[in-house]
Amino acid sequence: TQNKALPENVKYGIVLDAGSSHTSLYIYKWPAEKENDTGVVHQVEECRVKGPGISKFVQKVNEIGIYLTDCMERAREVIPRSQHQETPVYLGATAGMRLLRMESEELADRVLDVVERSLSNYPFDFQGARIITGQEEGAYGWITINYLLGKFSQKTRWFSIVPYETNNQETFGALDLGGASTQVTFVPQNQTIESPDNALQFRLYGKDYNVYTHSFLCYGKDQALWQKLAKDIQVASNEILRDPCFHPGYKKVVNVSDLYKTPCTKRFEMTLPFQQFEIQGIGNYQQCHQSILELFNTSYCPYSQCAFNGIFLPPLQGDFGAFSAFYFVMKFLNLTSEKVSQEKVTEMMKKFCAQPWEEIKTSYAGVKEKYLSEYCFSGTYILSLLLQGYHFTADSWEHIHFIGKIQGSDAGWTLGYMLNLTNMIPAEQPLSTPLSHSTYV
């Protein structure tokens, strides 16, 4: 007799990543009877919300509902109606909202309040909106990539089903770059984690992990650029800032009030004799790199070794997945290939930054100028952060894998967050059943 398919017994979950520059909605799906198995949850949809990050709505909170509508309606379409009521929705806000909360807890709460009000109008099971900590952001990113890479699975395979898989159970480190913060998370080799704030202990699938993590607030690519501009304008002789991190011929007017709006530039704030200044690009990688290095204080370290700003960092260990803006920027620059050495990356960046702005605009006519203009800075910043900030070397560069997706799911903190909040990562290894559940009878 012919096998007959039973109705699909699946569950869905939604996580909104409310980042500093934009919000993305992710829909995840998994077989209901395999919740505790590793690697069964996968992403079925990503919807990028049109507009800026939610922290920018602080003076227009009434617009948040409209802002979220398209992606929430998309979720309504993707998830079967019969599942709507059962589908959990979580919103996690990251460093953009951490910065807003530093300025005003009341304003941050007002934004989250309106987010809840808006999301409660949908048929899903809204679980909460909150600002996640930098430590959580690092930890959940680490869980996501290792879950997707099959590192928590006890089954050893003689063949590889996942890219980057080295067929061992050594976990990958996680490098996450956002607009307002950056995270580094990995399991150090037999090294004591000297600062308790940077130590995490997990028991996942019957195995203990001692994990190092740190989130550098204000060192995401957008806030790092604001920091650099605030630092450099201090020593400018007039309202012209000749900037090596922008292409030759590029010009942009910046309001001083915008520059000092963020808590990230407070340490560089001074009274300037002008309200605006003009950035004039000169496109010099080496000078740009030198200017960026001034953002990292490496003169002080109360531990055996540090990253920068007195933050403990153990010796790097194993392979690393670099995702979010690490990936997007390097992908744009065509530098994500495993075959490209660090020296080659530096060489390509030198050439790219030196290209005249008019030429760049012609070559990348489809790219918004706001984003296009910042790739020279962002690429240089990534190199500076990885090499001087985190102490990668030309040799260890090959251990960095620039990852966008793993098996169709985006690398990032959202999957790990949902797995944790829905209790889908057991502390102990689930008992294997003699027969796997079959979809067919």
Epitope: L112, E116, R117, S120, F126, Q127, G128, R130, L421
Partner: nanobody
Framework: QVQLQESGGGLVQAGGSLRLACTVS????????MGWFRQAPGQERDFVTA????????HYADSVKGRFTISRDNAANTVYLQMNTLKPEDTAVYYC???????????????????WGQGTQVTVSS
């Protein structure tokens, strides 16, 4: 881990009103859905009502709809239960409950990890 402290219980005549309060210490209050459950002598602990982190979602047991109102003041880290038109069958120990990043609907199902207060006695005399 959050800690919960109820207050406001007591003896009241049928048809009267009472307001219970539950103050939360530790944790970020807005990250928790808050709820009230009750347990009459010899009975199971039953769901009464729950409210989401910023108060936009509420659920009530059918037996209290229209009589009881849950509210919260996030600035004061406090959740309230206003009980009107009280009946003798409302007599029970009332427990405050907190559940982190859990919907009021899931609290109603007693799903997820719930932290409990020590309870406050409400007695409604006829």
């Amino acid at each position: 881990q959050v800690q919960l402290q109820e207050s406001g219980g007591g003896l009241v005549q049928a048809g009267g009103s009472l307001r219970l309060a539950c103050t939360v210490s530790r944790g970020t209050f807005s990250e928790y859905s808050m709820g009230w459950f009750r347990q009459a002598p010899g009975q199971e602990r039953d769901f009464v009502t729950a409210i989401s982190g910023f108060g936009h979602i509420t659920h009530y047991a059918d037996s209290v709809k229209g009589r009881f109102t849950i509210s919260r003041d996030n600035a004061a880290n406090t959740v309230y239960l206003q009980m009107n038109t009280l009946k003798p069958e409302d007599t029970a120990v009332y427990y405050c409950a907190a559940a982190w990043q859990t919907s009021p609907r899931r609290m109603m199902q007693m799903a997820g990890s719930i932290t409990w207060g020590q309870g406050t006695q409400v007695t409604v005399s006829s």
